[in-house]
């Protein structure tokens, strides 16, 4: 902490400007009014302060707002956000998507830090649910964001937000997460026609039950093997050879290359050899 010392004559800051970069830490502490800093936070980012100087500015804001910064200050924190701890951020009440975007921009290109995770958590909890605009914003900055949420957290995602999800956003989701997301996607895309529906729902099919896969097999969807490999084992096992053949269409030949891998291996093992032979792929149950 910086010791309390009187501001030297003529050094009292009247505005936040570049002259302050020449101030020593104790001078910043003594000569910069916290209220002035709060009202001119937008200028801080344009000034090349050292990390040590930023520590002093943060300290001044902490003294002015011991219960947490107001959103008018938070929105203009810029690089000072990197100095915040998760404990600091837990005191904030961030409601504006613009504020969230401004702070995520500061951390852009880096992995999600504990500070960012706390900020997002505060924001989403404040909104009560992950609406489409928020999800759009978060997945734009962090494509893996959706899959970092627990199944419980994902349950607060409204079906309307699913439209914002891109296939790559689901790359790291595990089966339990897809179990939660699939019914929402099914609801979101229910009014689309067959081929368009399949294009949209495909990324979510890792959460689909057997009856939905049976229904898809009647629609000439030609599911690729990569999607088939991500299906739930319990959903695949009850499918007949005929149903899998219809589901995969021309891709059925790909089963041979995956015959030693789950869930294909588990499915093959539970089929009658006579039925497998109808595929002409040499699969052994």
């Amino acid at each position: 902490e910086v010791e309390k010392t009187a501001c030297p004559s003529g050094k009292k800051a009247r505005e936040i400007d570049e002259s302050l970069i020449f101030y020593k830490k104790w001078e910043l502490e003594a000569c910069v009014d916290a209220a002035l800093l709060a009202t001119q936070m937008d200028r801080v980012n344009a000034i090349p302060f050292t990390y040590e100087q930023l520590d002093v500015l943060k300290h001044k804001l902490d003294e002015l707002y011991p219960q947490g910064y107001p959103e008018s200050v938070i929105q203009h924190l810029g690089y000072l956000f990197l100095k915040m701890s998760p404990e600091d951020i837990r005191k904030w009440n961030v409601t504006s998507l613009e504020t969230l975007k401004a702070l995520l921009e500061v951390n852009k290109g880096h992995e999600m830090s504990p500070q960012v995770a706390t900020l997002i958590d505060r924001f989403v909890k404040g909104r009560g649910q992950l609406d489409k605009d928020t999800l759009d914003t978060l997945t734009a900055f962090y494509p893996g964001y959706l899959c970092s949420l627990s199944p419980e957290e994902l349950s607060s995602v409204p079906p309307s937000s699913i439209w914002a999800v891109r296939p790559q956003d689901l790359d790291t989701c595990d089966p339990r997460q897809l179990d939660v997301l699939y019914p929402k996607a099914r609801l979101a895309f229910q009014n689309m026609n067959g081929s368009e529906y399949f294009v949209k729902i495909q990324s979510f099919l890792g959460g689909a039950p057997t009856e939905d896969l049976k229904a898809l097999s009647q629609q000439n969807v030609s599911m690729d093997l990569a999607t088939f490999m991500k299906l739930r084992t319990d959903a695949v096992l009850p499918l007949t050879v005929a149903e899998v053949q219809k589901l995969l269409g021309p891709h059925v030949e790909g089963l041979k290359a995956e015959e030693r891998h789950r869930p294909v291996r588990d499915w093959i093992l539970r089929q009658r050899q006579d039925d497998l032979d109808t595929l002409g792929l040499g699969l052994q149950g």
């Epitope: 089966p175 030693r260 789950r262």
Partner: antibody, heavy 119, light 107 residues
Framework: QVQLQESGPGLVKPSETLSLTCTVS??????????WSWIRQPPGKGLEWIGY???????NYNPSLKSRVTISVDTSKNQFSLKLSSVTAADTAVYYC???????????WGQGTMVTVSS | DIQMTQSPSSLSASVGDRVTITCRAS??????LNWYQQKPGKAPKLLIY???SLQSGVPSRFSGSGSGTDFTLTISSLQPEDFATYYC?????????FGGGTKVEIK
């Protein structure tokens, strides 16, 4: 609840065939969801999967042991068995039988039986 | 065959510590990864299946994460009964390989 019990000789001579049986109680070896595996663990070493069998008789073996392993199932006795031919001292291990549930993993194990290969 | 590499091979920790064990597959195995605990003279016990699902009856201090090639087993607060050897295993490929094991010892 399902329990597994291994049985068989504890001492086998080199070049002979090791034979073990696993008896399933409290459940059926003809379960749709389960395969039945043999796994071994040499003294002070890690686990090595030997192979599995499904009640239909379909088998799958560890490639490194495939030429010497035979696993069979007897649904009427609710048992499955392991035969490992041409044994050497390197086959000395604790041999476990285990249930492999398709949705979970090796969720039920026998207590293990020590088999020593020595003349 | 898919190779499974566990690290560390052994570690010393105290009761109450947070312990993390990692397992790496030589190729992608999706979420098909199981974790087992084995105590001396006993058969292994299934802790986690499908990378992150807790087996029935296993304390919630155990958790698993990961997908693809990199996986983690975490014990949030080590208890006296947790000192044991832990193995990862992949059921994705028909070779069913185990990791080499991680022995968790008392510091």
């Amino acid at each position: 609840q399902v329990q597994l019990q291994e049985s068989g000789p504890g001492l086998v001579k080199p070049s002979e065939t090791l034979s073990l049986t696993c008896t399933v109680s409290g459940g059926s070896v003809s379960s749709f969801t389960d395969t039945w595996s043999w796994i071994r663990q040499p003294p002070g070493k890690g686990l090595e999967w030997i192979g599995y069998i499904y009640y239909s008789g379909s088998t799958n073996y560890n490639p490194s042991l495939k030429s010497r392993v035979t696993i069979s199932v007897d649904t009427s006795k609710n048992q499955f068995s392991l035969k490992l031919s041409s044994v050497t001292a390197a086959d000395t291990a604790v041999y476990y039988c285990a249930r492999d549930n398709v949705f979970t993993g090796f969720d039920i194990w026998g207590q293990g039986t020590m088999v020593t290969v020595s003349s | 065959d898919i190779q499974m590499t566990q690290s560390p091979s052994s570690l010393s920790a105290s009761v109450g510590d947070r312990v993390t064990i990692t397992c790496r597959a030589s190729q992608s195995i999706s979420s098909y990864l199981n974790w087992y605990q084995q105590k001396p003279g006993k058969a292994p016990k299934l802790l986690i299946y499908a990378a992150s699902s807790l087996q029935s009856g296993v304390p919630s201090r155990f958790s698993g994460s990961g997908s693809g090639t990199d996986f983690t087993l975490t014990i949030s607060s080590l208890q006296p009964e947790d000192f044991a050897t832990y193995y990862c295993q992949q059921p994705y490929d028909a070779s069913y390989t185990f990791g080499g094991g991680t022995k968790v010892e008392i510091k």
